[in-house]
Interface confidence: low
């Protein structure tokens, strides 16, 4: 329903704390270079204004849209052009074009230093001094580095952060309490970020219909006892929530997400028997819990899918009568029977089914033509199953670091033109799929592996879009989202690539590597590995292993030496020579 003042409505619905957090996230995601203090000042001004509108909805400017109010605030920032260049041109536009312009200038890879965690004592001191400011910094730092982070979920992670600090800062050994807990939150938040970015990509590139199909499949897997009308309603609501967040309408998004959680908890009887535990939690935890709730038990007496979608004499009539509804019910019926498939696979099967009906329903004898469609799904199902088996076997054999290296070699060969930092980041992320998914029960592996890989590859595509360098990557990124992962998997060595000439300085290391944390050491070694492959794209696994073992031995020896600098400067050139010989 229409409210006289949108900002007063949202302030009342969300409450001051969440309102301020969401406005801070919105500003940080739009203007990613501004400091926390600059944004905090704007947030306070917006909040004070919202309060005047709550007191009197007819007060000046209270009837303006949120985009107008927020956009005017952003455009009033001093030195906008100096700091943000052409983004300042957005301010010459009117709404809604101005907001669209801001969205287009969001940077998926801002040149900001990595978010460093202060040491435990310092962190606890500043948290105790001012918890609100401390959490504000957290929201600001995460939001500016992840401009599409799902805002209500970021509030949830901030709440987790807060709870961990409250607990651990009271302990004697703060460090050993904080580190594993905060590492866990960071890992989950990073996965959440790439998953949400994938949803926004789906929405931006292929529209609401594509996202809604994704939602129908996902919800049908989770709630196999809900009827199609219920699933459609949930998918429609979820699509609206995600559209708002992806579009920068964070207050509406958080408000609608809370409404959806409320609806689900009020209607458990027609949705799922597994919701009660989630529904007993407070708002942010409840919505988070519902988003990853375990699958309900599948109904025991589901008829074979073929009855309605292959054997029924009226398949073509039903399809012609209401294509989207018919295909929607196919996706629903197939997905609720297959919690063991990835959403990407389910969408590929629905696409195959649609293509089959398009072709067959135009023929003289449609049933004879579409009668084999379910059998034709087999290769589409086998391909990701084999991918999971092969990769999980490799992960179990090599461990996470070794598995990342194997992926790095594979992807550098597929797309050697891509920058080394991007390849290393992608390989490290892709390699984490082993730890994340390969330890799960058999029936959960495929959805975990493929949907996670798809989200990581979406990031590869976004980074590549900025500076396209590889025909291979462009080809895979231009197709539909669900075909991307199979496309990347099918890529082989890029035969058009002219190998990089060997530069000794690329493989020259200094004693400072010895004091780096393990993760940074790994990145240095992986950078060298990618450069080796770029130099010799057709090097065998054995050759690369020989060189990398030699390299590891060299680091180990020199980092243990009394005079590290001398060791690096004398042994380094010998290593380079041996590498060249091994790869010759």
């Amino acid at each position: 329903e229409a409210h006289k003042s949108e900002i007063a409505h949202r302030y009342n619905d969300l409450g001051e704390q969440h309102f301020k957090g969401l406005v801070l996230i919105a500003f940080s995601q739009y203007l990613q270079k501004c400091s926390y203090d600059e944004h905090a000042k704007l947030v306070q001004e917006v909040t004070d204004f919202a309060k005047t509108c709550v007191a009197d909805e007819s007060a000046a400017n209270c009837d303006k849209s949120l985009h107008t109010l927020f956009g005017d605030k952003l455009c009033a920032i001093p030195n906008l052009r100096e700091n943000y260049g052409e983004l300042a041109d957005c301010c010459t536009k009117q709404e809604p074009e101005r907001n669209e312009c801001f969205l287009q200038h969001k940077d998926d890879n801002p040149s900001l230093p990595p978010f460093e965690r202060p040491e435990a004592e310092a962190m606890c001191t500043s948290f105790k001094e001012n918890p609100t400011t401390f959490m504000g910094h957290y929201l600001h730092e995460v939001a500016r580095r992840h401009p599409y982070f799902y805002a209500p979920e970021l509030l949830y992670y901030a709440e987790q952060y807060n709870e961990i600090l409250t607990q651990c800062c009271a302990e004697a050994d703060k460090e050993s309490c904080l580190t594993p807990k905060l590492d866990g939150v960071k890992e989950k938040a990073l996965v959440s970020s790439v998953r949400q970015r994938m949803k926004c990509s789906s929405m931006q590139k292929f529209g609401e219909r594509a996202f809604k199909a994704w939602a129908v499949a996902r919800l049908s897997q989770t709630f196999p006892n809900a009827d199609f009308a219920e699933i459609t309603k949930l998918a429609t609501d979820l699509t609206k929530v995600n559209k708002e967040c992806c579009h920068g309408d964070l207050l509406e998004c958080a408000d609608d997400r809370a409404e959806l959680a409320k609806y689900m908890c009020e209607n458990q009887a027609t949705i799922s028997s597994k919701l009660q535990t989630c529904c007993d939690k407070p708002l942010l935890k409840k919505a988070h819990c519902l988003s990853e709730v375990e699958h309900d038990t599948m109904p025991a007496d589901l008829p074979a899918i073929a009855a309605d979608f292959v054997e029924d004499q009226e398949v073509c009539k039903n399809y012609a009568e209401a294509k989207d509804v018919f295909l929607g019910t196919f996706l629903y019926e197939y997905s609720r029977r297959h919690p063991d498939y990835s959403v990407s696979l389910l969408l590929r099967l629905a696409k195959k089914y649609e293509a089959t009906l398009e072709k067959c329903c135009a023929e003289a004898n449609p049933p004879a033509c579409y009668g084999t469609v379910l059998a034709e799904f087999q290769p589409l199902v086998e391909e990701p199953k084999n991918l999971v088996k092969t990769n999980c076997d490799l992960y179990e054999k090599l461990g996470e670091y070794g598995f990342q290296n194997a992926i790095l070699v594979r992807y550098t060969q597929k797309a050697p033109q891509v920058s080394t930092p991007t390849l290393v980041e992608a390989a490290r992320n892709l390699g984490r799929v082993g730890t994340k998914c390969c330890t799960l029960p058999e029936d959960q592996r495929l959805p975990c592996v493929e949907d996670y890989l798809s989200a990581i590859l979406n990031r590869v595509c976004l980074l590549h879009e900025k500076t396209p360098v590889s025909e291979h990557v462009t080809k895979c990124c231009s197709g539909s989202l669900v075909e991307r992962r199979p496309c990347f998997s099918a890529l082989t060595v890029d035969e058009t690539y002219v190998p990089k000439e060997f530069k000794a300085e690329t493989f020259t290391f200094h004693s400072d590597i010895c004091t780096l944390p393990e993760k940074e050491k790994q990145i240095k070694k992986q950078t060298a590995l990618a450069e080796l492959v770029k130099h010799k794209p057709k090097a065998t696994a054995e050759q690369l292993k020989t060189v990398m073992d030699d390299f590891a031995q060299f680091l180990d020896t020199c980092c243990k030496a009394a005079d590290k600098d001398t060791c690096f400067s004398t042994e380094g050139p010998n290593l380079v020579t041996r590498c060249k010989d091994a790869l010759a």
Epitope: A229, D308, E314, N318
Partner: nanobody, 128 residues
Framework: QVQLQESGGRLVQAEDSLRLSCAAS????????MGWFRQAPGKEREFVAA????????DYVDSVKGRFFISRDIAKSTVYLQMNNLKPEDTAVYYC?????????????????????WGQGTQVTVSS
């Protein structure tokens, strides 16, 4: 013959939510479109919402779109009407109705007319 029994109607405040249930007994529930209708004092009975026999398609009168939601539980032979953000003008006796399918597909939209079986009704009063 299908017997229908509505429940869940009561007095509520404006903007509250309410959920009506309609339990069906008798002939096979699955082969019926199910609808909700309402009649305000001194007015004609009007269509509110309907769901087709497989629960695959729904239809709503414009004034309730986005506020009311119809669903069915085939196993329990029950149809529900979830009513959110209620307004005083939603005050009426709400009737559940069923109509036998006649050759339309499981994807056909449910009808707004031609309902043969009716419940006794349940009173919903929304005070401002």
């Amino acid at each position: 013959q299908v017997q229908l029994q509505e429940s869940g109607g009561r007095l509520v405040q404006a903007e509250d939510s309410l959920r009506l249930s309609c339990a069906a007994s008798g002939r096979t529930f699955v082969s019926y479109d199910m609808g909700w209708f309402r009649q305000a004092p001194g007015k004609e009975r009007e269509f509110v919402a309907a769901i087709n026999w497989r629960g695959y398609t729904t239809d709503y009168v414009d004034s309730v779109k986005g506020r009311f939601f119809i669903s069915r539980d085939i196993a329990k032979s029950t149809v529900y009407l979830q009513m959110n953000n209620l307004k005083p003008e939603d005050t009426a006796v709400y009737y559940c109705a069923a109509r036998q399918m006649s050759g339309s597909s499981r994807y056909s939209p449910p009808g707004r007319v031609g309902y043969d079986f009716w419940g006794q009704g349940t009173q919903v009063t929304v005070s401002s």
